[in-house]
């Protein structure tokens, strides 16, 4: 059986949309599947790598690598999207390409970044972890760390940094899929909203879905002990 909830929820484009949340009901009347997984149920994606989920994550990453920051021209906010999802008339799509990207580092002026820009994250304005020396962030945004400390500046002069961010990674469903969404939409979908991150590649949704002890390597499920828990 399914339980359907419909509600007007604030979406990425800054408008309220009617959204359906479909919850698979427990046949025996009890905890939901998400709760059961958290309690230690035998859920194979938490025990070993699941090919289907792995393919989903890789597909999400490939899309994210090509994303940019969609900044609304009316200064209402910005969100990380694909070019096709960013209005050509109402917004500006900030994407480094060809020769427009910043240099990888002040020590290497010739090599330009082509992956990015990312809403509210830039190697030139992140103090911790700083992109310098032996720790220059790679030219692949899906390999960027979470910036834990931004440079103290009210305005950076960068369009993708000075906007109000409207969406962050949200882990939705037992499959551990990730979407950049508003907090409101994420909460309605019973997802896990990552306030600290800017990209889906920075969060490990399956680790959140599984709960219990975190995976030793966030990319590799290792909860073999579930076989004895349930």
């Amino acid at each position: 059986a399914q339980h359907v909830t419909t509600q007007l929820v604030l979406r990425n484009k800054g408008v309220y949309e009617s959204v359906k949340y479909i919850q698979q009901e427990n046949f025996w009347i009890g905890p939901s599947s998400i709760d059961l997984i958290h309690l230690g149920a035998k859920f194979s994606p938490c025990i070993r790598k699941d090919q289907q989920i792995e393919q989903l994550v890789l597909r999400e990453r490939d899309l994210e690598r090509d994303s940019g920051c969609c900044v609304q021209n009316d200064h209402s906010g910005c969100i990380q999207t694909q070019r096709k999802d960013c209005s050509e008339t109402l917004a500006t799509f900030v994407k480094w390409q060809d020769d427009t990207g910043p240099p990888m580092d002040k020590s290497d002026l010739g090599q330009k970044r082509t992956s990015g820009a990312v809403c509210h994250q830039d190697p030139r304005t992140c103090e911790e972890p700083a992109s310098s020396g032996a720790h220059i962030w790679p030219d692949d945004i899906t390999k960027w760390p979470i910036c834990t400390e931004q440079a103290k500046s009210n305005r950076t002069g960068f369009l993708h940094m000075d906007c109000q961010i409207k969406g962050r990674p949200c882990c939705i469903s037992t499959k551990g899929s990730c979407e950049i969404t508003t907090r409101e939409y994420c909460e309605f979908m019973h997802g896990y909203f990552h306030e600290e991150a800017t990209l889906c590649s920075q969060v490990h949704c399956l680790d959140k879905v599984c709960g219990l002890l975190p995976f030793l390597n966030p990319e590799v499920p290792d909860q073999f002990y579930r076989l004895w828990l349930s």
Partner: antibody, heavy 123, light 106 residues
Framework: QVTLKESGPGILQPSQTLSLTCSFS??????????VGWIRQPSGKGLEWLTN???????YYNSVLKSRLTISKDTSKNQVFLKIANVDTADTATYYC???????????????WGTGTTVTVSS | QIVLTQSPAIMSASPGEKVTMTCSAS?????MYWYQQKPGSSPRVLIY???NLSSGVPVRFSGSGSGTSYSLTISRMEAEDAATYYC?????????FGAGTKLELK
Amino acid sequence: QVTLKESGPGILQPSQTLSLTCSFSGFSLSTFGMGVGWIRQPSGKGLEWLTNIWWDDDKYYNSVLKSRLTISKDTSKNQVFLKIANVDTADTATYYCARIAAYGSNYWYFDVWGTGTTVTVSS
Amino acid sequence: QIVLTQSPAIMSASPGEKVTMTCSASSSVSYMYWYQQKPGSSPRVLIYDTSNLSSGVPVRFSGSGSGTSYSLTISRMEAEDAATYYCQQWSSYPLTFGAGTKLELK
């Protein structure tokens, strides 16, 4: 308000070491992304970049003059220093220090310049 | 090193006249920066990232170009624009400036 002021000996003899100081206010070189550069200009001629120093103590020099240049900073005193060893009459010029804009540009640029100090190398 | 060649070396213009000067790079650069220097004064930045106007710079100034060819335009010359203009690149070390274009008032 950001200001920079250069100071130096004014006149010195060939083979001596030129020591210049750039004293600044309105910003700190301990601030992430900040930098200061030195540029010189012989009288009636164009601008020549010499060196940059950054908040993280990274230093970059003009390769043509690198063996003679040394840049350093005293963050607590808001000062940057430049030494040019073994000077020659060709080093006679007005020396400018300039702040490097930390943000806003895809690269960087010299957004605020000092008034310059004139140095004459003469025997 | 990247050599920047500015032309013309000297030019004159009447008030209200449109002025265009160019900067040619010996190899491709990503962006160009333009500075204005008046006699007895230090340089000040006019344009950064090829076409962005620095704060406080009149809108009659504009920059354009890409690759090896860049230009600075003054839409309507004013007396206070008489100065020497330098282009500068930050695409590779050593950082280099052009030799300058001296703009005189006719």
